[in-house]
Interface confidence: medium
C-alpha cells in the first residue's frame, strides 16, 4: 500500500507539471524578451529614446550596410546559418562613439575630440579590422584637404603632446560632405594591450584656407555625423568540454 | 459545465503523456541504436562478423590515423565541436574496397583487380583527395620497383584495353612490405561524372626480375592488405530555410 | 525533413511548429536597430512514443530513477540564430549573432 | 555555464544531466570500428517555471491553443556530435560526423 501511495504522489507531481497553465502569447513574448536580454548580457533594456538614437546613429556607410542586410518589414530575418549551440550572442562588429575624457579637456580648456572607451572584453588579437570614420563638411569650391589623425600622449620634455597616427591628402569638390575612413587597427591593438596609453586622439581636416572640415562635435542639423570607430572582431566562443 | 468537462479531458490527456512509463536503461540504449542507424541512413545494422572485419579492415596508414583520433577506452569521444544542428551524419572519408566486375572477369577468363563501385551520392566537385593505396610484398634483395596503374577502357580498334593512369619508380629494400599511395583524384572525378567509364583498373608493381609485388587478391596471412581507395570529401549538408 | 508545420487554424494535435512573430517596435524596444521584427515560432502538441523523436536522450529515463520526468515533450529540435544590430547602452552599437532564436523544427524528446 | 550535472547517486529532483555510456561492443555492433563506446548522457528531472529555461519557445503556449502541451520539459539544450568510423555494409568504411549524439547540457523548455 505504501508503494502505491508513493506512486500516486509521483503521478500527482507529474500531473502538476503537466497541467501547468498554458500561457498567453504575451507571456511567450515576455519570455523571449527576457531571453534576449540575457543572451546579450544586459540586465535591463537600454534606456534610450528615439531622439537620442536619431542623434547618435551614424549616418555612415558601414551602418547603412549593416541595416541594409535586413528587410526589416519582412517577417523572417533569420539567416538560416548553423546553430552556434551556445547561449550568448557573439559579437561581429562594434561601433563605438566618442566619450569625454578628463585628459583631453585639460589640453587647452575646451573639450577636444576624441576619446574612445573600450571594453576589456575585446582582445587585441581578435581584432580583424578597425576604422575611424570621420565626416568632412561640404566645401564651397574644389579644394585639397589634409587629414591628420594625432594620438594624444603624456607630455614629453619638449612639451610634445601628440604623435601622428595617419595623414592623408584628398581632393574634395563642392556638393555634399563625405565620410572618410582611416585604418587604425594597429593603434587600437596597442590601446587594448596597454589601456593606459589610450589618452585620446585629435582629428584635423584642413582645407587650403586652413578651415577645419572635420565634424568632431556636431552642430545643429549635424545629428549622426560624429566620428566613430568601427571594429570588426572574430568572436569564437571558447567551447570547453566538461 | 461543458467547458469544465473539456478541461478535464485535456488534463487527462496531459496526464496520460505525463505518466507515460519511465523506460529502463536498455530501452534508452535501444532508442539510441535506432537513432544511430537512422542518422547513418542504414535500415539495419550491417551484418558483418569480427572475422570479416579482420579480413577487410585495411592495415594501412590512413586507417591507423583515423583510429588514433579516438581514445577508444576513454568514455567520452565527443570532439566538443559545434553542433551541426542537422540530423544525418556527414561523411568526411570513404574507404572503398574493390568488388568484382563482369567486365574485368572477361578480360582473360580470371578475375582481375580492381573494380571500385561508387555511390551516386558522391559528387565529383566535393572530392578533396582520392588516393589508391596498394601493398607491396617484401623483397629479398634491394630492387627497383615499377608501379603502374592502368585504367580499363572499352576495347579500341587496335585492341587496346588499357590506358595509363599513373607510373612511378621506387626503391625497395629487404624487410617488410610497404604501403604506397597513388593520387587518383582526377580519375575518380571523371568516373563520378561519367559512371559508365568506370570499368576498373589494373595494378602492376614489377621488380627488376618481373615479379609482381602488388597484393591484389590477398593470400594466406595477407588479411587487410587488399588495395583500397581513400576518398576525402567535403560534405556540407544543404540547409534550406523554410 | 522531420517535423510538422502548423498554423493557428490547424486541427493537428501532434507536436507541431506554430508561427510567432516578435515585433520589437510594438513593445518599444527602439534600442534594437535591426531587425524591427522577426519570426521566432514555437512548439506545441502531443507526443506519442517515438513520434518525430529526434533525441532519445530525454524521455527514456531509468526506471529506478524517475525524478519527475514527464515523458516525451514537444520541443525545438532545430534552431537557428538571428543577426542583430543594437545599442548596448554604453555609447556602442553592436552587430552580432544571437544563437537559438528561431525554431526551425519541433519534435518529441 | 547553464544546466546541472548529476549522477545515479544524486538526490537532485530538478532537471539534470545524467551519465549514460553507449558501448557498441557490448551489444555486438562490431561494424562500428571506432569509437567502441561513447558517453551519450541523458536528461531527467522536474521543471519548475523558468528553471534552467533555455528556449521559451515550447512551453509558453497560446492559451486558446493548448494542443496537449505538457508544460516545461527537461530536455537537451546543448548537444554535440561524435566522429565515427564504421562499415556501411557496402564494402566501404566511412569516417564521418554524427550530429547531436552527446547531451552536453539539460534545461527546461
Amino acid at each position: 500500500e505504501n508503494s502505491e501511495q508513493k506512486e500516486n504522489v509521483e503521478k500527482e507531481g507529474l500531473c502538476n507539471a503537466c497541467t501547468w497553465r498554458q500561457n498567453t502569447k504575451s507571456s511567450r513574448i515576455e519570455a523571449i524578451k527576457i531571453q534576449i536580454l540575457s543572451k546579450l548580457r544586459l540586465e535591463t533594456a537600454p534606456n534610450i529614446s528615439k531622439d537620442a538614437i536619431r542623434q547618435l546613429l551614424p549616418k555612415a556607410p558601414p551602418l547603412r550596410e549593416l541595416i541594409d542586410q535586413y528587410d526589416v518589414q519582412r517577417d523572417d530575418s533569420s539567416d538560416g546559418s548553423l546553430e552556434d549551440d551556445d547561449y550568448h550572442a557573439t559579437t561581429e562588429t562594434i561601433i563605438t562613439m566618442p566619450t569625454e575624457s578628463d585628459f583631453l579637456m585639460q589640453v587647452d580648456g575646451k573639450p577636444k575630440c576624441c576619446f574612445f572607451k573600450f571594453s576589456s572584453k575585446i582582445q587585441y588579437n581578435k581584432v580583424v579590422k578597425a576604422q575611424l570614420w570621420i565626416y568632412l563638411r561640404p566645401v564651397e569650391t574644389p579644394t585639397t584637404v589634409f587629414v591628420q589623425i594625432l594620438r594624444l600622449i603624456k607630455p614629453m620634455k619638449d612639451g610634445t603632446r601628440y604623435t601622428g597616427i595617419r595623414s592623408l591628402k584628398l581632393d574634395m569638390n563642392p556638393g555634399t560632405g563625405i565620410w572618410q575612413s582611416i585604418d587604425v587597427k594597429t593603434v587600437l591593438q596597442n590601446w587594448l594591450k596597454q589601456p593606459e596609453s589610450n589618452l585620446g586622439i585629435e582629428i584635423k581636416a584642413l582645407d587650403e584656407n586652413g578651415h577645419d572640415l572635420a565634424v568632431t562635435f556636431p552642430g545643429p542639423g549635424e545629428d549622426g555625423l560624429n566620428p566613430f570607430l568601427e571594429v570588426k572582431v572574430t568572436d569564437t566562443p571558447k567551447r570547453s568540454r566538461r | 459545465e461543458n467547458s469544465e468537462q473539456k478541461e478535464n479531458v485535456e488534463k487527462e490527456g496531459l496526464c496520460n503523456a505525463c505518466t507515460w512509463r519511465q523506460n529502463t536503461k536498455s530501452s534508452r540504449i535501444e532508442a539510441i541504436k535506432i537513432q544511430i542507424l537512422s542518422k547513418l541512413r542504414l535500415e539495419t545494422a550491417p551484418n558483418i562478423s569480427k572475422d570479416a572485419i579482420r579480413q577487410l579492415l585495411p592495415k594501412a596508414p590512413p586507417l591507423r590515423e583515423l583510429i588514433d583520433q579516438y581514445d577508444v577506452q576513454r568514455d567520452d569521444s565527443s570532439d566538443g565541436s559545434l553542433e551541426d544542428d542537422d540530423y544525418h551524419a556527414t561523411t568526411e572519408t570513404i574507404i572503398t574496397m574493390p568488388t568484382e566486375s563482369d567486365f574485368l572477369m572477361q578480360v582473360d577468363g580470371k578475375p582481375k583487380c580492381c573494380f571500385f563501385k561508387f555511390s551516386s551520392k558522391i559528387q565529383y566537385n566535393k572530392v578533396v583527395k582520392a588516393q589508391l593505396w596498394i601493398y607491396l610484398r617484401p623483397v629479398e634483395t634491394p630492387t627497383t620497383v615499377f608501379v603502374q596503374i592502368l585504367r580499363l577502357i572499352k576495347p579500341m580498334k587496335d585492341g587496346t584495353r588499357y590506358t595509363g593512369i599513373r607510373s612511378l619508380k621506387l626503391d625497395m629494400n629487404p624487410g617488410t612490405g610497404i604501403w604506397q599511395s597513388i593520387d587518383v583524384k582526377t580519375v575518380l572525378q571523371n568516373w563520378l561524372k561519367q559512371p559508365e567509364s568506370n570499368l576498373g583498373i589494373e595494378i602492376k608493381a614489377l621488380d627488376e626480375n618481373g615479379h609482381d609485388l602488388a597484393v591484389t587478391f590477398p593470400g594466406p596471412g595477407e588479411d587487410g592488405l587488399n588495395p583500397f581507395l581513400e576518398v576525402k570529401v567535403t560534405d556540407t549538408p544543404k540547409r534550406s530555410r523554410r | 525533413d522531420f517535423g510538422l508545420d502548423c498554423d493557428e487554424h490547424s486541427t493537428e494535435s501532434r507536436c507541431c511548429r506554430y508561427p510567432l512573430t516578435v515585433d520589437f517596435e510594438a513593445f518599444g524596444w527602439d534600442w534594437i536597430i535591426a531587425p524591427k521584427r522577426y519570426k521566432a515560432n514555437y512548439c506545441s502538441g502531443e507526443c506519442e512514443f517515438v513520434f518525430l523523436q529526434k533525441y532519445p536522450h530525454t524521455h527514456l529515463v531509468h526506471q529506478a530513477n524517475p525524478r519527475g520526468s514527464a515523458g516525451p515533450c514537444c520541443t525545438p529540435t532545430k534552431m537557428s540564430p538571428i543577426n542583430m544590430l543594437y545599442f548596448n547602452g554604453k555609447e556602442q552599437i553592436i552587430y552580432g549573432k544571437i544563437p537559438a532564436m528561431v525554431v526551425d523544427r519541433c519534435g518529441c524528446s | 555555464d547553464f544546466g546541472l550535472d548529476c549522477d545515479e547517486h544524486s538526490t537532485e529532483s530538478r532537471c539534470c544531466r545524467y551519465p549514460l555510456t553507449v558501448d557498441f561492443e557490448a551489444f555486438g555492433w562490431d561494424w562500428i570500428i571506432a569509437p567502441k563506446r561513447y558517453k551519450a548522457n541523458y536528461c531527467s528531472g522536474e521543471c519548475e517555471f523558468v528553471f534552467l529555461q533555455k528556449y521559451p519557445h515550447t512551453h509558453l503556449v497560446h492559451q486558446a491553443n493548448p494542443r496537449g502541451s505538457a508544460g516545461p520539459c527537461c530536455t537537451p539544450t546543448k548537444m554535440s556530435p561524435i566522429n565515427m568510423l564504421y562499415f556501411n555494409g557496402k564494402e566501404q568504411i566511412i569516417y564521418g560526423k554524427i550530429p547531436a549524439m552527446v547531451v552536453d547540457r539539460c534545461g527546461c523548455s
Epitope: - | 596508414p61 591507423r64 590515423e65 577506452q73 576513454r74 612490405g177 604506397q180 | - | -
Partner: antibody, heavy 119, light 110 residues
C-alpha cells in the same frame, strides 16, 4: 639503403630544451609514420610519440605538455623537441619507422642517441 | 594510464628448451590484435619479431611465434638458441594515439 639516424646534443642541463633530429634515407616521410621511443639506462622501452604520415602528432600522456614532434619532408627529417628537461629524462632516444604495435611498425630503428641531463 | 605487465621478469633456460613469455594489458588492445613483440640485445636497438599479435616479421626464424587476443598475449620460442639471449618487450596499441611497452622479460641461456 633504408636508414634512420638520430642526432643532437649528448649533454643537456636541467630546465633546458632538448632538440633531436631523426634523418631518414630511403624512406618517404609523406607515406611513413615515425615514432620516438626512449630507454633510460638499464631500464625498459618507453613510448614517447609519433608523427604520422599525414603530419598528425600523438604524444605519450606524460610528454603532452613538453613535447613537440615535427617533420620536414623535403629534408627527410623528423624533429623532436622536449622542453624543461630533468635528470629523469636521461635516456637513449630512438626513432623508428612506423608505429610499434601497429602493423609491422618498428621494423626499422635508428641506433639511438644517449642524452644525459645533468648540471 | 595503461599498464602492460610482462612475466616472468627473468627466464633462465637451457638451449633447446621451450620459452613462454607472457604479456597482460590493463585494457584490451585495439581490434584485439594491435600487439607486437620486440627483441633487444645490449647496446642495440630493438628488433621486431611479431606483429598483429601472431604475424611473424620478415626474416625472423620460425621458432618464434605469437598468440593471444584482447588483453592476454604469449610469445613462444619453441627451441631456445644461444643467440636468443636478450630482453623481450611487448608493445600494445589502443587507438586514440596511445601506445605502451611492457617492462620486459630477460631471457638467459644456462
Amino acid at each position: 639503403q633504408v636508414t634512420l639516424k638520430e642526432s643532437g646534443p649528448v649533454l643537456v642541463k636541467p630546465t633546458e630544451t632538448l632538440t633531436l633530429t631523426c634523418t631518414v634515407s630511403g624512406i618517404d616521410l609523406s607515406h611513413t609514420d615515425i615514432s620516438w621511443v626512449r630507454q633510460a639506462p638499464g631500464k625498459g622501452l618507453e613510448w614517447v610519440g609519433i608523427i604520422s604520415y599525414a603530419g598528425k602528432t600523438y604524444y605519450a600522456s606524460w610528454a603532452k605538455k613538453r613535447l613537440t614532434i615535427s617533420k620536414d619532408t623535403s629534408k627527410n627529417q623528423v624533429v623532436l623537441t622536449m622542453t624543461n628537461m630533468d635528470p629523469v629524462d636521461t635516456a637513449t632516444y630512438y626513432c623508428a619507422r612506423g608505429v610499434p604495435a601497429y602493423s609491422h611498425g618498428g621494423d626499422l630503428w635508428g641506433q639511438g642517441t644517449l642524452v644525459t641531463v645533468s648540471s | 594510464d595503461i599498464v602492460m605487465t610482462q612475466s616472468p621478469a627473468t627466464l633462465s633456460l637451457s638451449p633447446g628448451e621451450r620459452a613462454t613469455l607472457s604479456c597482460t594489458s590493463s585494457q584490451s588492445v585495439y581490434h584485439a590484435n594491435w600487439l607486437s613483440w620486440f627483441q633487444q640485445k645490449p647496446g642495440q636497438p630493438p628488433k621486431l619479431l611479431i606483429y598483429w599479435a601472431s604475424t611473424l616479421a620478415y626474416g625472423v626464424p620460425s621458432r618464434f611465434s605469437g598468440s593471444g587476443s584482447g588483453t592476454d598475449f604469449t610469445l613462444t620460442i619453441s627451441s631456445l638458441q644461444p643467440e636468443d639471449a636478450a630482453t623481450y618487450y611487448c608493445a600494445g596499441g589502443y587507438g586514440g594515439g596511445r601506445y605502451a611497452f611492457g617492462q620486459g622479460t630477460k631471457v638467459e641461456i644456462k
